[in-house]
C-alpha cells in the first residue's frame, strides 16, 4: 500500500496537493471517499489527489483483506 501511494504522490509536486493525497489514505470506515472529498475547499487539485489516493488505498485494503480471508480458509 505504502509503495503504491508513494508512487501516486510522487506525481504531485505541490506539497499541499501531495498532502491531500496522503489525507485520502487515512482509514475512515464511516464515509466513502466521495463523501470525504466533498468537504475539501482548497481546490479541485486537492479533491482529485485525495480521491485518487483514497480510492486506490481502499481497493488495496479490500484486496488484502480478501486474500487474508482466502488464506484463512
Amino acid at each position: 500500500l505504502q509503495e503504491k501511494i508513494e508512487e501516486i504522490a510522487a506525481k504531485y509536486k505541490h506539497l499541499v496537493v501531495k498532502k491531500c493525497c496522503y489525507d485520502g489514505v487515512r482509514i475512515n470506515h464511516d464515509e466513502t471517499c466521495e463523501q470525504r472529498a466533498a468537504r475539501i475547499s482548497v481546490g479541485p487539485r486537492c479533491v482529485k489527489a485525495f480521491t485518487e489516493c483514497c480510492v486506490v488505498a481502499s481497493q488495496l485494503r479490500a484486496n488484502n483483506s480478501h486474500k487474508d480471508l482466502q488464506l484463512g480458509r
Epitope: 505541490h14 506539497l15 499541499v16 496537493v17 481546490g43 486537492c46
Partner: antibody
Framework: QVQLVQSGAEVKKPGSSVKVSCKAS????????IHWMRQAPGQGLEWMGY????????NYNENFKGRVTITADKSTSTAYMELSSLRSEDTAVYYC???????????WGQGTTVTVSS | DIVLTQSPASLAVSPGQRATITCKAS??????????MNWYQQKPGQPPKLLIY???NLDSGVPARFSGSGSGTDFTLTINPVEAEDTANYYC?????????FGGGTKVEIK
C-alpha cells in the same frame, strides 16, 4: 470583499528578526493557502513560502535556509511571516497573497517595506 | 525548480500598437491538459495584479485587450491595442509545483 491587510513598515538592524502580519477578511480564512513573496528595490518577485491555515501545512523556498517561518492564527484570520538573521540584502517589500484553487494568486496584500540597516 | 525566462526585458510600444511578451519554462507546466501558468501586472508602488490565469483565462475586470496563449513550456501575453495606462511591469508565474517561481519581469513603456 476579500482583503489582505499587512502590518506597517519596519526598520531593522542586521542580525535581528522581523515579523510581518497579513490579516484576511471577506472570505473563510481556512479555505485558501496564503503565500509570501518579496521584492527587492528595482527587482523582480521572489517566492518565500506558504501556509495552508486549515491544516497548518507549510512549505518554504530553500534559498532562505531555514531563516523564514510562516504561521497562521485561525482565531484572528491572520498569517505571519518571520524572517531571522536579517542582512542588508533582505531590504525589500514583502507581500502576502491568497492562492485560489491551488492555481493562482487572486488577492494580494498592499505590501510591507522592511529596511535592514545598521 | 522550474525556471521561467521572460523576454524581452523591456519594450516601448506606441499607443494602439501590439505588445507581445513571452515566457519560456525550463520544463512543462502542463498537467493533464491544464497549464499552470499565470500573468500579473505591477504598477509602481502597487502589489501585482492578476491578469491571466491557466495560460489563457482573463481574470474578471481585466480589459479584453489583454490575452494569453501557449501551452507546455512556451507562453505569450499580448496587449492589443496598448493604452497609456498599460505602462507597468509584467510577470509570468507557475503554480504547478513548489517552489512557485516567477519570470524576471518585462517593463512595458508607452512611447
Amino acid at each position: 470583499q476579500v482583503q489582505l491587510v499587512q502590518s506597517g513598515a519596519e526598520v531593522k538592524k542586521p542580525g535581528s528578526s522581523v515579523k510581518v502580519s497579513c490579516k484576511a477578511s471577506g472570505y473563510t480564512f481556512t479555505d485558501h493557502i496564503i503565500h509570501w513573496m518579496r521584492q527587492a528595490p528595482g527587482q523582480g518577485l521572489e517566492w518565500m513560502g506558504y501556509i495552508y491555515p486549515r491544516e497548518g501545512w507549510t512549505n518554504y523556498n530553500e534559498n532562505f535556509k531555514g531563516r523564514v517561518t510562516i504561521t497562521a492564527d485561525k482565531s484572528t484570520s491572520t498569517a505571519y511571516m518571520e524572517l531571522s538573521s536579517l542582512r542588508s540584502e533582505d531590504t525589500a517589500v514583502y507581500y502576502c497573497a491568497r492562492e485560489r484553487n491551488l492555481e493562482y494568486f487572486d488577492y494580494w496584500g498592499q505590501g510591507t517595506t522592511v529596511t535592514v540597516s545598521s | 525548480d522550474i525556471v521561467l525566462t521572460q523576454s524581452p526585458a523591456s519594450l516601448a510600444v506606441s499607443p494602439g500598437q501590439r505588445a507581445t511578451i513571452t515566457c519560456k519554462a525550463s520544463q512543462s507546466v502542463d498537467y493533464e491538459g491544464f497549464n499552470y501558468m499565470n500573468w500579473y501586472q505591477q504598477k509602481p508602488g502597487q502589489p501585482p495584479k492578476l491578469l491571466i490565469y491557466a495560460a489563457s483565462n482573463l481574470d474578471s475586470g481585466v480589459p479584453a485587450r489583454f490575452s494569453g496563449s501557449g501551452s507546455g513550456t512556451d507562453f505569450t501575453l499580448t496587449i492589443n491595442p496598448v493604452e497609456a495606462e498599460d505602462t507597468a511591469n509584467y510577470y509570468c508565474q507557475q503554480s504547478l509545483e513548489d517552489p512557485h517561481t516567477f519570470g524576471g519581469g518585462t517593463k512595458v513603456e508607452i512611447k
